[in-house]
């Protein structure tokens, strides 16, 4: 029987700046039952602040809801393990709202072959950005990532949209089904999960030609 | 309606004790910090008292410390101030206030009235 | 312990003039800085954190402003309904130190 192991705070995600949470990785638990609390204060400040709220994060998590989240602030938190046998901590880790957000994928992915009588055809893809992200605020800059594939291939094609939320592709295989996705991330942040995907059937008549 | 209630003043002697009480209502008690500010009559305000959410951790204004202890009990939703060694100076209207997320006093009770005299 | 000095402690002034508090710290607080209204009789209110965020349903005529060790609450039009003493308070590390107050009157 031994003092828990140390822990490590891996990761803190934010999906659009007015929340987050954080997670840690428990050391060894020295063979009895062992204890999680997170600590934390700001920058600048040495109140000592315990974490709110541990379940909605999920296992080994630190929830910040809206109202213990801040932007302007840098946030120094570590977690200590304790059991009967005594205590470690983990390192401190200091974590900057604004660099954590992950935002939730790209909503309403719409994609639609046009077919112009006057100009080459083309793929048309929509989407919207996701739902907890107010863009209006000017907090945010969202860019975008598109990738499609036929169906059977192996290899994704990616295009880069930047902040636009449609984009045109004209070089597609005719009489291929095309999966198409689309994910985003803020100017400082992480990119989203990709969204679900969306099937398109290339006619065989559309033309690659000039 | 978020709510704080205070009850337990009274008037002491010196060197008395008195035990303060606050319930909450309207919020999740236990993801809150609670603290103890006093003001004396015609004074200003002075925080006495801090406590985390579960209560691990306190901090006290120097002139109490030793004196007063600080509590909670979260199934309670009640936070307490345990006063001893009462003196003179300790007369004021008590109140408990929730810090909120950014650590700043959002709400506030009425007061509890302490009178400590001979 | 970082001290908290307010000024002037009493001021009178007619209704529409501008009024300025000052709130100094002894030491830099950042901007971990709350305001708060206490008017006679009554419980204090929260009017600004943060030094310059105006809590919500807190009338546009208060302000604040300031960082490090100097910072002001500033009314640009005094109202009847602001007689009250104003305080400032630190939240950067205990003591919560709360400054002496500024009683506002009307002239």
């Known amino acids: 029987q031994l003092p828990p192991g140390k822990p490590e705070i891996f990761k803190c995600r934010s999906p659009n700046k007015e929340t987050f949470t954080c997670w840690w990785r428990p050391g060894t638990d020295g063979g009895l039952p062992t204890n999680y609390s997170l600590t934390y204060h700001r920058e600048g400040e040495t109140l000592m602040h315990e974490c709110p709220d541990y379940i909605t994060g999920g296992p080994n998590s630190c929830h910040f809801g809206k109202q213990y989240t801040s932007m302007w602030r840098t946030y120094i938190m570590m977690v200590n393990a304790t059991n009967q046998m005594g205590s470690s901590f983990s390192d401190e880790l200091y974590v900057d709202v604004t660099y954590i957000v992950q935002p939730d994928p790209p909503l309403e992915l719409a994609v639609e072959v046009k077919q112009p009588e006057d100009r080459k055809p083309y793929l048309w893809i929509k989407w919207s950005p996701p739902t907890l992200i107010d863009l209006k605020t000017g907090w945010f800059t969202l860019l975008y990532e598109i990738r499609l594939k036929p169906e059977k291939a192996a290899e994704w094609e990616i295009h880069f949209a930047g902040q636009q939320t449609e984009f045109k592709i004209l070089s597609l295989h005719p009489g291929q089904k095309y999966l198409v996705q689309v994910r985003c991330k803020p100017d400082h942040g992480y990119w989203s999960a990709w969204s679900p995907a969306t099937f398109i059937q290339i006619p065989s008549d559309f033309t690659m030609n000039d | 309606e978020v709510q704080l209630v205070e009850s337990g003043g009274d008037l002491v002697q010196p060197g008395e004790s008195l035990r303060l009480s606050c319930t909450a209502s309207?919020?999740?008690?236990?993801?809150?910090?609670m603290n103890w500010v006093r003001q004396a009559p015609g004074k200003g305000l002075e925080w006495v008292s801090y406590i985390s959410s579960s209560g691990g951790t306190k901090y006290y204004v120097d002139s109490v410390k030793g004196r007063f202890t600080i509590s909670r009990d979260n199934a309670k939703k009640s936070l307490y101030l345990q006063m001893n060694s009462l003196r003179a100076d300790d007369t004021a209207l008590y109140y408990c206030?929730?810090?909120?997320?950014?650590?700043?006093?959002?709400?506030w009770g009425q007061g509890t009235m302490v009178t400590v005299s001979s | 312990d970082i001290q908290m000095t307010q000024s002037p402690s009493s001021l009178s002034a007619s209704v529409g003039d501008r009024v300025t508090i000052t709130c100094r710290a002894s030491q830099d607080i950042f901007n971990y800085l709350a305001w708060f209204q206490q008017k006679p009789g009554k419980v204090p209110e929260l009017l600004i954190s943060?030094?310059?965020t105006l809590q919500s349903g807190v009338p546009s005529r208060f302000s604040g402003s300031g960082s490090g060790t100097y910072f002001t609450l500033t009314i640009s039009s005094l109202q009847p309904e602001d007689i009250a003493t104003y305080y400032c308070?630190?939240?950067?590390?205990?003591?919560?130190?709360f400054g002496g107050g500024t009683k506002v009157e009307i002239k």
């Open positions: 206030a929730r810090l909120n997320g950014v650590d700043v006093f959002d709400i």
């Open positions: 308070q630190r939240y950067n590390s205990a003591p919560l130190t």
């Open positions: 943060a030094a310059s």
């Open positions: 309207g919020f999740t008690f236990n993801s809150y910090e």
